[in-house]
Interface confidence: medium
Amino acid sequence: MEDFNMESDSFEDFWKGEDLSNYSYSSTLPPFLLDAAPCEPESLEINKYFVVIIYALVFLLSLLGNSLVMLVILYSRVGRSVTDVYLLNLALADLLFALTLPIWAASKVNGWIFGTFLCKVVSLLKEVNFYSGILLLACISVDRYLAIVHATRTLTQKRYLVKFICLSIWGLSLLLALPVLLFRRTVYSSNVSPACYEDMGNNTANWRMLLRILPQSFGFIVPLLIMLFCYGFTLRTLFKAHMGQKHRAMRVIFAVVLIFLLCWLPYNLVLLADTLMRTQVIQETCERRNHIDRALDATEILGILHSCLNPLIYAFIGQKFRHGLLKILAIHGLISKDSLPKDSRPSFVGSSSGHTSTTL
C-alpha cells in the first residue's frame, strides 16, 4: 500500500487541507471552517463539471426565457394586469439571479478567486433574488385568490399599491440578505481552495441559527403556506363556478404548485436535516455529513433550475404569452401580421377582469 505519511507539525494542521463542503445556495450557515474541515469528503471530479454544465444550461435558458417574458410584458403597456407586474418583477429576479450563475459555476471548479468585494456583491445579488423570487410567487397566488375567490378589483386596481408591494418585496429581500453582505468574505485556508462564505468569528451559535432559519422560513415555508392556502381556495372556487377558462386555470395553477414543490421541497428537507445535525438535535457523523453534502448539491440544482422554469410555467403554458410574443415579432416585421391570432391582446397572463388576471 502506498503510504502518504505526511506528518503534521501540530494536531490542528493534521485536520487542514481537507476539501470544504460546497457552500449551498441560500444556505447561510457555513461549513465548520474555523478549525479546519474534519471529514474526508466523498466527492467525484465528474460531479463538479456536471454541476457547471447544469449551471450553464440554466443560465442560458433563464436568460432567454426571462428576457422574453420581460419583453412581452413591457411591450403590452395598455392592458397590463397586476399579475403582469408581479411577473415582470419575478422575471427580473430570476434574470438577475441567472447572471450570477457563471461566477458560481467558475467557483465550483477553482474555488472563490474573485475576492471579497465580488463575494459580497454576487452573494447579495443571489440572496436578494432568491427571496424576492419566492415572495413574488406568493404575491401572485394572493392576487389570483383575491381575483377569483373574492372577485376583488378595488385593492389591486390601485397601481401605486402594487408598486408599493413590489418595492416592499425587494426591500424585505434586501433586509433578509443583509447578513450575507455583512458577514460574507473570501476565506483562505492552507491547502484548500479559497471559499466565499459567512465568517462571523466568535459570534454566538444563536446568530448562526438565525442565519440558517431565515431562508428556510421566509424563503420556503411561509411562501409555500401562502401558495397552498390561496391556490387551494382558488381551485375550490373554480370547481364550484362554471368558468370557461376553468380547466386552463387549473392546469396552470397545478403546474405552479407542483413545480414549486418539486424544485424547493427536496432542498429544504435536506437543509432541515442539515440544520438539525449542525445544532446537534441529531448526532452528526462524517458519514451523515457526506450524505447530506451530496444531497444538498443535488437538490440545490433543482432549486436553481426553478429560475429558468418560471417563464415556462407562468408564460409558455398560457396562450396569451405566445400571442404577445407573436405581436412583437409582427411589429418588427419578423413574421407576417396575418399569422397573428384574431383575439390577440397585449396582456399575456390570461383573461383579465379589469386589472386583475384570473388565469395564466
Epitope: D3, F4, N5, M6, E7, S8, S10, F11, E12, F14, W15, G17, E18, F32, L33, L34, D35, A36, P38, C39, E40, E42, Q280, E284, T285, C286, E287, R289, N290
Partner: antibody, heavy 122, light 106 residues
Amino acid sequence: EVQLLESGGGLVQPGGSLRLSCAASGFTFSSYAMSWVRQAPGRGLEWVSAIRGSGAGTYYADSMKGRFTISRDNSKDTLYLLMNSLRAEDTAVYYCSKLEAVSGTGKYFQHWGQGTLVTVSS
Amino acid sequence: SYELTQPPSVSVSPGQTANITCSGDTLGDKFACWYQQKPGQSPVLVIYQDTKRPSGIPERFSGSKSGITATLTISGTQAMDEADFYCQAWNSRGVVFGGGTRLTVL
C-alpha cells in the same frame, strides 16, 4: 453495525517490531480519520496516533514519534500500526478506534475495537 | 502526567448523584467528551461535545462545562454504573485523556 477488529498482538522482545491490523466494517472507512489508543495494565487510556481518511496525513503522540507508523489501506478497509524499537513500557492493550471529528473543536471516539494485547518482555 | 485532571476516585450511594470533574486549559476552547470503561471491556462513549448523549446511553448520564472544567453527572446512580470514567479533548499536540476516575457505587 460498526465493527472494528484488531489483530497482530502478542509477545515481543524489547527492540523488536510488531504490526497491528484493524479490520473495519459497517461504515464508509475512507470517510473517517482513524486512531490507535493504548492502555497499559492497570493504567489509563493513552492516545497513540491518528490518520486522516485519505491516508494523506498522520499524527503521533510525542513518545511514539519516530518509532511507530500508522497507515491504512482503504481498498481493504484496514488500519495498521507498525511498532519498531519496542520497549517494556509499550506493553498495553492497543485499541483501534474510529475518530469522529464533526466540528472544528470536537473530536471523539465513537467506536472502539475489542483491543489486542502487546507484551514487550525478554 | 495527564493534561486533563480528574479525581482518582468518586464514591456514591445507589440512587444518589455522582459528579466527576475534568479540568484542563484545552477545555477553554475545545469540546470535552466522556468514556465509561468497565473491567475487561473496551471504553464506551457516554457524552460528546460537552453535553450530547449518543443514542443508547441512558438519560441519567449528562455533561456540562464551565470555563476549563467539564463535569460528568450521573443521576440516580445504579450498581451497573460502577466503572472507570475518562474525559477526553484535544490540543495542538494531539488527543488528550484524563487520568481516569474510578466510580464506586457503595
